[in-house]
Interface confidence: medium
């Protein structure tokens, strides 16, 4: 996505040999060299650059596609009802907007790898700041949602029961400013830069290294490992909750929660290990090399990717795992295909209200 | 135009501490790895400190290591050179310089210059 | 440190003249890198990896050598030449200059 060139020591005659005469390839690099000036593996950056120029314009249309079409149809199916939306189905909605808005993105950045970054530097901060907004607010909207679910059923808790769309809408709006304020950065430090070395424009970060180092641990612990932990910690404490009350009801409708946080898991713990070893070697607690840069470039290149595709995933999952959301998605292709028939749009959502567990721990999706 | 404009210079006592300032221009200093470079009056250039382009690697000879600090302000487009401890042969000509790329990387010679600023240490 | 020593330090030459200045290292180096300065002006990159000359050099100046000694050469001597040339070696640190070699108009 955005480029971040990552600072590299000054090469020194030794290696410009070593890099004219090939022998770059095995360089490597301790504590020991960080005295004599301008030590550094000659990485050229042909090898990741060309494989994100193949890659990442194909991956993100596809995405994009998949992403605009999915989250278009979970948001539809929300939207359509005629019931006030549960707490649950209000947080899925700000996560399909969130994703929504992500995967807009997704062309600007696949122009950036193919060619170069050509939207100016006002579109540059918007585009860097709205992919972050979205990646934070996914991440933690899917935490809202467990703590929520955590709630109602280990603690029979309804925090969003009086009032429901004043405490939900009051927590999204939270969780928004809270990932604008994340993306201040971009606002701030997200330029057009002409890069003599590339020899091409691109959409880059313009600070110091101490800082693209705290916004990757910022990016690492509130975009990941505490949504994770949050998520982890709920859905665990939920489980054991619904298996000792032997709630098989519950524990079918639990069912999608949990694929919904396995894939979170799935999808980004890769990308998160490649940003961890990303700051071991800018920490210097990882020595760099060319093999290990170029690997790490390339690893960042299909990991995000891998993310990103999480934009996708979760329509499908409610399509493939969510009874009520193929009801309802049914319903909706049915009504807009025979605007006549309004008989189709009475679903039978109410027994699921009327249900007394559900009132006070409702443990599935609910809308989906 | 590539341009390196240097300031701080001026007279200072031994012991004393002054910081130099160099505002770069005409290309994208984000890039570029910079170093100062001196020259005593009527004598020859003497290497003084280098930084990195993101500012992570830092080097100097060993006559100026813990006396002085070479820094950057990128979002400025801007080099410094703290100065503290400062003895009589410090005197010179303090030059801002630009390290070219090769390859996609920072080379070691310096391929633009500052005009210079003059520091005179003396009590 | 590897010291390099420039010769002469000084040299009076006339215009048209062919005139090599040479730099020896105290120890082996890659490449050597020269620099033109004038009065009161800052260094310009002269010549660069030994050999290859820097953007807006004329042709009459060349560069050579490997190892311990490398040479400026130029040609044809003309007024705008005379300067002080200085050589650079950046293979290990500190990266050091030689002393000059003060060109002048005999």
């Known amino acids: 996505m955005v480029l971040e060139v990552s600072d590299h020591q000054v090469l020194n005659d030794a290696e410009v040999a070593a890099l004219l005469e090939n022998f770059s390839s095995s360089y490597d690099y301790g504590e020991n060299e960080s005295d004599s000036c301008c030590t550094s593996p000659p990485c050229p950056q042909d090898f990741s650059l060309n494989f994100d120029r193949a890659f990442l314009p194909a991956l993100y249309s596809l995405l994009f596609l998949l992403g605009l079409l999915g989250n278009g149809a979970v948001a539809a199916v929300l939207l359509s009802r005629r019931t006030a939306l549960s707490s649950t189905d209000t947080f899925l909605l700000h996560l399909a907007v969130a994703d929504t808005l992500l995967v807009l993105t997704l062309p600007l950045w696949a122009v950036d790898a193919a060619v170069q970054w050509v939207f100016g530097s006002g579109l540059c901060k918007v585009a860097g700041a709205l992919f972050n907004i979205n990646f934070y607010a996914g991440a933690l909207l899917l935490a809202c949602i467990s703590f929520d679910r955590y709630l109602n059923i280990v603690h029979a808790t309804q925090l969003y029961r009086r009032g429901p769309p004043a405490r939900v809408t009051l927590t999204c709006l939270a969780v928004w400013g809270l990932c604008l304020l994340f993306a201040l950065p971009d606002f701030i430090f997200l330029s057009a830069h002409h890069d003599e070395r590339l020899n091409a424009t691109h959409c880059q970060y313009n600070f110091p290294q101490v800082g693209r180092t705290a916004l990757r641990v910022l990016q690492l612990v509130a975009g990941f490992l505490l949504p994770l932990l949050v998520m982890a910690y709920c859905y665990a404490h939920i489980l054991a909750v619904l298996l000792v009350s032997r709630g098989q009801r519950r524990l079918r409708a639990m069912r999608l929660v949990v694929v919904v946080v396995v894939a979170f898991a799935l999808c980004w713990t890769p990308y998160h290990l490649v940003v961890l070893v990303d700051i071991l070697m800018d920490l210097g607690a990882l020595a760099r090399n060319c093999g290990r840069e170029s690997r790490v470039d390339v690893a960042k290149s299909v990991t995000s990717g891998l993310g990103y595709m999480h934009c996708c995933l979760n329509p499908l999952l409610y399509a493939f795992v969510g009874v009520k959301f193929r009801e309802r998605m049914w319903m909706l292709l049915l009504r807009l295909g025979c605007p006549n028939q309004r008989g189709l749009q009475r679903q039978p959502s109410s027994s699921r209200r009327d249900s007394s567990w559900s009132e006070t721990s409702e443990a599935s999706y609910s809308g989906l | 135009e590539v341009q390196l404009l240097e300031s701080g210079g001026g007279l200072v006592q031994p012991g004393g501490s002054l910081r130099l300032s160099c505002a770069a221009s005409?290309?994208?200093?984000?890039?570029?790895?910079m170093s100062w470079v001196r020259q005593a009056p009527g004598k020859g250039l003497e290497w003084v400190a280098t930084i990195s382009h993101g500012g992570t690697y830092t080097y100097y000879p060993d006559s100026v290591k813990g006396r002085f600090t070479i820094s950057r302000d990128n979002a400025k487009n801007t080099l410094y050179l703290q100065m503290n401890s400062l003895r009589a042969e410090d005197t010179a000509v303090y030059y801002c310089?630009?390290?070219?790329?090769?390859?996609?990387?920072?080379?070691?010679?310096?391929?633009?210059w500052g005009q210079g600023t003059l520091v005179t240490v003396s009590s | 440190d590897i010291q390099l020593t420039q010769s002469p330090s000084f040299l009076s030459a006339s215009v048209g003249d062919r005139v090599t200045i040479t730099c020896r290292a105290s120890?082996?180096?890659?490449?050597l890198y020269w620099y033109q300065q004038k009065p009161g002006k800052a260094p310009k990159l002269w010549i660069y990896f030994t050999s290859t000359l820097a953007p807006g050099v004329p042709s009459r100046f060349s560069g050579s050598g490997s190892g311990n000694e490398y040479t400026l050469t130029i040609s044809s001597l003309q007024p705008e030449d005379f300067a002080t040339y200085y050589c650079?070696?950046?293979?290990?640190?500190?990266?050091?200059f030689g002393q000059g070699t003060k060109l002048e108009i005999k």
């Open positions: 650079q070696q950046f293979t290990s640190s500190p990266y050091t």
């Open positions: 005409g290309f994208t200093f984000t890039s570029y790895a």
């Open positions: 120890s082996g180096v890659n490449y």
């Open positions: 310089a630009r390290h070219p790329i090769y390859s996609g990387n920072y080379q070691g010679y310096f391929d633009y």
